[in-house]
Amino acid sequence: GITSINCSGDMWVEPGEIFQMGMNVSIYCQEALKHCRPRNLYFYKNGFKEEFDITRINRTTARIWYKGFSEPHAYMHCTAECPGHFQETLICGKDISSGHPPDAPSNLTCVIYEYSGNMTCTWNTGKPTYIDTKYIVHVKSLETEEEQQYLASSYVKISTDSLQGSRKYLVWVQAVNSLGMENSQQLHVHLDDIVIPSASIISRAETTNDTVPKTIVYWKSKTMIEKVFCEMRYKTTTNQTWSVKEFDANFTYVQQSEFYLEPDSKYVFQVRCQETGKRNWQPWSSPFVHQTSQETGKRNWQPWSSPFVHQTSQTVSQVTAKSSHEPQKMEMLSATIFRGHPASGNHQDIG
């Protein structure tokens, strides 16, 4: 940009150097050159000479007018054609920007990843503003009324050390740029309700050599939370449809889950957990790939006919990936297919 130009005159922009995208804009150039009575004043945008909508106002001043200016940034400068000079003479230059006032931040979410020592808040910023936009996160104790503010760009991590005064907070985000300000909706946060258990990891899997082979998946977490509810999803690598099993887990020991799967197939497993009764899930664990062994005896394969797991399995459902490029985003394909015992299966968050 043109930030350190030595001007021989002035350049100014109406309505201002930063303006709302789509507005009509006038840019003025006023020369103050010594020993020059310019024949012409010229405007350049991003180095290219402009030909249209230029008005000579008087001997020293010209204006260029843009209808519905919609470029996020432009570098403007103007020059003078002085008699007796072979080259044009620079008068002045300006960086101009157009953009939008911010949208109100939406989908504000705050979580505490176990052992992180931080409350992490994220939000949707809305449509691009094209100009520098700041986010101010307000955290107000509902018990002491004390309010803290944090500057952020797209998320914020707030040390839980600074949240020791109380457990209940009101959190909201202000989006601010030179064209306006908008507030998110306020989020009521109870620190005890937003903890996400330490990451769950699938450590290994093995398929037994029995007449009806079974696959045992071993998985663990370092969480100290006693009551944890987990989902494991699995599918063949060639399939779009995930099956999902639900578990009540106790991570004082390694979890073992048994599956009766198709032989000689490559399966992908992922697991995620939440504190029982809470709403925030871990992200799905890294995909764990396991190849089942070849079928030994000849028999009709009925993958849904056998018991699924010796551990308390609540439900098995199927979900389908929306596209092979977005395996994390799932939607429910069918109702519960298998139910070991009554449960309040809840899948609105899958993916």
Partner: nanobody, 116 residues
Framework: QVQLQESGGGSVQAGGSLRLSCAAS????????MGWYRQAPGKERELVSM???????FYADSVKGRFTFSQENAKNTVYLQMNSLKPEDTAMYFC??????????WGQGTQVTVSS
Amino acid sequence: QVQLQESGGGSVQAGGSLRLSCAASGYTYSSCTMGWYRQAPGKERELVSMLISDGSTFYADSVKGRFTFSQENAKNTVYLQMNSLKPEDTAMYFCGCATLGSRTVWGQGTQVTVSS
């Protein structure tokens, strides 16, 4: 840690002017996003003006065209020029230093009272 000290408040008639100053000391000043805030009795603290980036300043709708934010880097000082003051501008005015991811630091504030 940056320390902030406001000055320039006082009592003025409606239509009058005041210029608030905020002097910053401490090594983190250069990384601050500086702002002016105000808090009227019984109300939440609100953002009045903030320096977003070079050549870009936010002004609350209620002060647009009347207040001007400026800074003097050599003196580590920011200013709020307040013209055409109204009774509803009466409040305690604070300057704040915000750095990414850190808690905003406030000055002690300076009182502005506008009488009709």
